[in-house]
Amino acid sequence: EVEKTACPSGKKAREIDESLIFYKKWELEACVDAALLATQMDRVNAIPFTYEQLDVLKHKLDELYPQGYPESVIQHLGYLFLKMSPEDIRKWNVTSLETLKALLEVNKGHEMSPQVATLIDRFVKGRGQLDKDTLDTLTAFYPGYLCSLSPEELSSVPPSSIWAVRPQDLDTCDPRQLDVLYPKARLAFQNMNGSEYFVKIQSFLGGAPTEDLKALSQQNVSMDLATFMKLRTDAVLPLTVAEVQKLLGPHVEGLKAEERHRPVRDWILRQRQDDLDTLGLGLQG
């Protein structure tokens, strides 16, 4: 807390400008009007305030807006955002994607902080769902964002948003998350032709059921081993040797190198030896 002291004569701030960097903390508290600060927040980022001075400015805004800052102020917080706690942010009502982008820009290059996580949570809850534009924005700043959501949270992602997802956005997703995302992707890409469809759906296939894998095996897709290794074990087990051969195409030879790894080892174990022998790879069931 900064003590309440009278502003020295002639020091009352008429605007937010660089002269304020020479003010001591108590002078900032006494001489800067909170309402003036709120209307000229966009200027704060251009001025090299110290962390201690930023603490004073935050304190003034907190006093002016005890119920939470209005979006007009939030949008221009800039580096002052780094001073906010998750508790502060929970009081906000952020509805503009531009505001979200402005604040994410401040944290760019760093891992997702608790403040950013809270901000995103408030924003998405305010919108009611994770729409395409929001997802575009969030994955641009945090490629792993999608995989940080619980399966329950992912269920609110509309299929139309799936178009914004890039393969690298799914790198850290676990099987339960892909179980939720795959049906949405299937719906989103349903009108694409065979080869284009496979390119789009490929990174979601860790959530695909057996029947969809069987259908893909009839389409000459030539799935690579890296994708095959990410398939659900229970979805792979019922596939016949012929179906796996069709699914992988020329990549089927890669099964030999993966024979000790899941899901290949589980699948091999469940095949008849004479069927495995037709592959000519020396796989032993």
């Epitope: 676990d174 099987p175 074990t233 087990l237 790894h261 899941r262 080892r265 174990l269 469940r270």
Partner: antibody
């Protein structure tokens, strides 16, 4: 509710063959989704996987024990068995049978049987 | 073979504490990581499978996270019955291997 029960001698002489049987009740050893493993734990030490079998008779053994291990299955008796040859004192352990279910984990275990190798 | 390294090997904690145990695989194992609890004289009991899925009947204070090579088991609020040894296990590649165990003792 699937249950597993190990049985076999608690004392085996060095250089002889350790033989244990695991009886499956409340379920079938012929399940499509499950494999059946043997795991052991020397006194005061950690867990070591010995190998597993599928109802078809297909097996997979730990390379460190492969030359001495045989796991077999008898679907008519709903049992699977372990044979470990040429035992030494280092094979003294609690031996567990376990089911590796469709979730890829050992979700059901027997209570374990202590086998001591001593003359 | 894939080596599983658990840390710490032992820890002392009090009832109500938040406890975190880590497990590292010597190569990527995707999400094929399971956690078990073992009490003296008893068989291990499955707690978490596929890195983060809670086994049926296991209290929700247990949770798992991670993928690739680094995994964590968390007990959000330690209860008297949770004092035991915990093992991680990879099911990605044979031979199936376990971590060395973490003994959770009463402080």
């Amino acid at each position: 509710q699937v249950q597993l029960q190990e049985s076999g001698p608690g004392l085996v002489k060095p250089s002889e063959t350790l033989s244990l049987t695991c009886t499956v009740s409340g379920g079938s050893v012929s399940s499509f989704t499950d494999t059946w493993s043997w795991i052991r734990q020397p006194p005061g030490k950690g867990l070591e996987w010995i190998g597993y079998i599928y109802y078809s008779g297909s097996t997979n053994y730990n390379p460190s024990l492969k030359s001495r291990v045989t796991i077999s299955v008898d679907t008519s008796k709903n049992q699977f068995s372990l044979k470990l040859s040429s035992v030494t004192a280092a094979d003294t352990a609690v031996y567990y049978c376990a089911r590796e279910g469709k979730n890829g984990a050992f979700d059901i275990w027997g209570q374990g049987t202590m086998v001591t190798v001593s003359s | 073979d894939i080596q599983m390294t658990q840390s710490p090997s032992s820890l002392s904690a009090s009832v109500g504490d938040r406890v975190t145990i880590t497990c590292r695989a010597s190569q990527s194992i995707s999400s094929y990581l399971n956690w078990y609890q073992q009490k003296p004289g008893k068989a291990p009991k499955l707690l978490i499978y596929a890195a983060s899925s809670l086994q049926s009947g296991v209290p929700s204070r247990f949770s798992g996270s991670g993928s690739g090579t680094d995994f964590t088991l968390t007990i959000s609020s330690l209860q008297p019955e949770d004092f035991a040894t915990y093992y991680c296990q990879q099911s990605y590649s044979t031979p199936l291997t376990f971590g060395g165990g973490t003994k959770v003792e009463i402080k």
